[in-house]
């Protein structure tokens, strides 16, 4: 449905971000984000900046990372003479009024924006090779960038379910995006996978009075393990449960508990 949906990520705070490769004018990009249930993304500072950088660095878009790419963000200079000396955004401001981190913690300008007192001016995030953020760059609002960044805000998120014996995991987020993995998922996200014997399973993140949880999921493991051990959320055998220092690196599967020896699982 949305072929331009490339990557998404959510943080525990309830903020999710998606990055899209699509040649669009600013207005069309802003509308695309609204249609997905979000808004053109702010990239203020701190956690927000880190989340967006992680999306960019997850891999190049079309062209294989050979050229610089420009992504629309919610940064603009309203009509009227902004103060170009106002650091660090040179008079530009974020569209949404929600408080962010310190704006001194933002990216640099790739080149100094021009002064203009007449037209509304926009800005893009320039990414070197499509993956390494170089900084902000002024761009006329009616020109086309290579893509755009959307932001979504949710009150609660589901932590990623542990696969257990599941394979072929696929996430479908409510902002119309398919992904192979999300650390946190907003309500409405559907996770599908295959259990042993190629049995399909599908769970959905739902929100209730308590918080967010995966429906139809007993515990937090998608597919039960045939054995007793899980390592990093996946089924494991006892020999694979020792870390480099000989410590026990596994946890016990549902129905088992850690034995007295501290390194084996016994029936609970």
């Amino acid at each position: 449905e949305h072929p331009t949906a490339d990557r998404a990520g959510c943080s525990a705070s309830g903020a999710c971000y998606s990055l899209h490769h699509a040649t669009m004018k600013r207005q069309a990009a802003e509308e695309a984000c609204i249609l997905r249930g979000g808004a053109l993304s702010t990239v203020r500072a701190g956690a927000e900046l880190r989340a967006v950088l992680a999306l960019l660095r997850a891999g190049p878009g079309p062209g294989g990372g050979s050229k610089d790419l420009l992504f629309w963000v919610a940064l603009q200079l309203p009509p009227g003479c902004g103060d170009p000396k106002r650091l660090p955004l040179r008079g530009f401001s974020w569209l949404s009024s929600d408080p962010g981190g310190l704006e001194s913690d933002t990216l640099q300008w790739v080149e100094e924006p021009q002064r203009s007192c007449t037209a509304r001016r926009c800005a893009v995030l320039q990414a070197t090779g499509g993956v390494e953020p170089a900084g902000w760059k002024e761009m006329r609002c009616h020109l086309r960038a290579n893509g755009y960044l959307c932001k979504y805000q949710f009150e609660v998120l589901c932590p990623a379910p542990r696969p257990g014996a599941a394979s072929n995991l696929s996430y479908r987020a409510p902002f119309q995006l398919h992904s192979a993995a999300l650390d946190f998922s907003p309500p409405g996200t559907e996770v599908s996978a295959l259990c042993r014997g190629q049995l399909p399973i599908s769970v959905t993140c739902i929100a209730d009075e308590i918080g967010a949880r995966w429906d139809k999921l007993s515990g937090d493991v998608l597919c039960p393990c045939p054995g007793r051990y899980l390592r990093a959320g996946k089924c494991a055998e006892l020999p694979n449960c020792l870390d480099d220092l000989g410590g026990f690196a596994c946890e016990c599967a549902t129905g088992f508990e850690l034995g007295k020896d501290g390194r084996s699982c016994v029936t609970s």
């Epitope: 699509a22 669009m24 509308e31």
Partner: antibody, heavy 117, light 108 residues
Framework: EVQLQQSGTVLARPGASVKMSCKAS????????MHWVKQRPGQGLEWIGA????????SYNQKFKGKAKLTAVTSTSTAYMELSSLTNEDSAVFYC????????????WGQGTSVTV | QIVLTQSPAIMSASLGERVTMTCTAS???????LHWYQQKPGSSPKLWIY???NLASGVPARFSGSGSGTSYSLTISSMEAEDAATYYC?????????FGGGTKLEIK
């Protein structure tokens, strides 16, 4: 001058499908989202969905998923909406519309296609 | 989805009278994304006021719009015969974009 020219009145049987068109002129078809809106006789307006002809991105109102399918042909600057499994509830005037000069207000509308089931 | 409730559903006004109709949103809407349309029988809707208070091209200055958050209104300072129509408020702050049920304005 921006114009959206829609196909003519349709009379259809229950259970059938219809496909209506919206030919755009006077602007760059691939640069703007095209929206579709439903209006039942004597009633208000309902947003069905939108398509971005530049890359065929679509977004639907949940209510119309499975009922409406939006497509676009860039070579002819024409957007299409197909309605399937028609019932009496689908008898309405359907408008294609898009924003152009004003932020997110749908400021150009076709003349409407009337569908009677 | 955001539900827009318009009131009154039907109203009549004398020529020269001041007219105000309201649009209440079920949750807060940015004023940039609240618009009004005018529709007359047999015609397509026309953008009338955009971003709460900006008059669309060709709209007479007797029309004005105001509001913020969940409460918006359209006012005609002095009713004229050509103003008889149905007016719809419309939001595009959240998808799906939604319309109010309309206020039908008649001449008394």
């Amino acid at each position: 001058e921006v114009q959206l020219q829609q196909s003519g009145t349709v009379l259809a049987r229950p259970g059938a499908s219809v496909k209506m068109s919206c030919k755009a002129s006077g602007y760059t078809f691939t640069s703007y989202w095209m929206h579709w809106v439903k209006q039942r006789p004597g009633q208000g307006l309902e947003w069905i969905g939108a398509i971005y002809p530049g890359n065929s991105d679509t977004s639907y109102n949940q209510k119309f998923k499975g009922k409406a399918k939006l497509t676009a042909v860039t070579s002819t600057s024409t957007a299409y909406m197909e309605l399937s499994s028609l019932t009496n509830e689908d008898s309405a005037v359907f408008y294609c519309t898009h924003y152009y000069g004003s932020d997110y207000a749908m400021d150009y509308w076709g003349q409407g296609t009337s569908v009677t089931v | 989805q955001i539900v827009l409730t318009q009131s009154p559903a039907i109203m009549s006004a004398s020529l020269g009278e001041r007219v105000t109709m309201t649009c209440t949103a079920s949750s807060s809407v940015s004023s940039s994304y609240l618009h009004w349309y005018q529709q007359k029988p047999g015609s397509s809707p026309k953008l009338w006021i955009y971003s709460t208070s900006n008059l669309a091209s060709g709209v007479p200055a007797r029309f004005s719009g105001s509001g913020s958050g969940t409460s918006y209104s359209l006012t005609i300072s002095s009713m004229e015969a050509e103003d008889a129509a149905t007016y719809y408020c419309h939001q595009y702050h959240r998808s799906p974009r939604t319309f109010g049920g309309g206020t039908k304005l008649e001449i008394k």
